[in-house]
């Protein structure tokens, strides 16, 4: 049985065509902002504003930058080392249960309840019963929803889990 061959033992028979700015990998990995070449000999920089990588890696490509959808504002742009950060517009919020969409905040509390928390990009207004002070977990009324990307979620070309 022959042992697994390391990349140092193997000479690629054909090299990929020159691409972006290159540097050498460190212990087989490329730094954030880069991906590795097919032959594992070069680190190729991600394209600013197009794709990125956040960690040391040996991936063949950088991850595609998220585009903020309508209904979202861009808090910070995509760089070669960090994905775009998007946030729901004022008056809308993103729930943990449905992070793919911004929902409109309620305009007021149901009768017999008082508002104790404002609408934020990550939470609806918070209502409590006037007497007991217990939180209200009523359904958000049906609203026109804009499907959006989750903030900081890499919009990669496809799922690695297939």
């Amino acid at each position: 049985e022959s042992a697994l061959i390391t990349q140092q033992d193997l000479a690629p028979q054909q090299r990929a065509a020159p691409q972006q700015k290159r540097s050498s990998p460190s212990e087989g990995l490329c730094p954030p902002g880069h991906h590795i070449s097919e032959d594992g000999r070069d680190c190729i920089s991600c394209k600013y504003g197009q794709d990125y990588s956040t960690h040391w890696n040996d991936l063949l490509f950088c991850l595609r930058c998220t585009r903020c959808d309508s209904g979202e504002v861009e808090l910070s742009p995509c760089t070669t080392t960090r994905n775009t950060v998007c946030q729901c517009e004022e008056g809308t919020f993103r729930e943990e249960d449905s992070p793919e969409m911004c929902r409109k905040c309620r305009t007021g509390c149901p009768r017999g309840m008082v508002k104790v928390g404002d609408c934020t990009p990550w939470s609806d207004i918070e209502c409590v019963h006037k007497e007991s002070g217990t939180k209200h977990s009523g359904e958000v009324p049906a609203v026109e929803e804009t499907v959006t990307s989750s903030p900081g979620t890499p919009a990669s070309p496809c799922s690695l889990s297939g």
């Epitope: 193997l10 054909q14 087989g28 063949l60 496809c158 690695l160």
Partner: nanobody, 121 residues
Amino acid sequence: EVQLLESGGGEVQPGGSLRLSCAASGLTFPNYGMGWFRQAPGKEREFLAVIYWSGGTVYYAESVKGRFTISRDNAKNTVYLQMSSLRAEDTAVYYCAVTIRGAATQTWKYDYWGQGTLVTV
């Protein structure tokens, strides 16, 4: 969903030749490598060869260099392993696999695997 389907395995006489095929579907990565491995009974899975889709870079294991040739058909999303001068020690289950990592000659660098096709010499 990524699917890999190997074919072409079978019984062959020592010194004979065989061509294995691996058809891939569901691959939407910007670049990837398709590799061949084999596993004989009671032995570890062994890397044989890999070919990359964008640049066509190819790697072979020393144990098969000169006897085995890896090639691809981009239009059919299929990779081939042409095996010649086969010997008894080439008897194994041959697996096709996909990697999204560079210079991928280790088993752990592969994310997707086919079911395998048996080659008996």
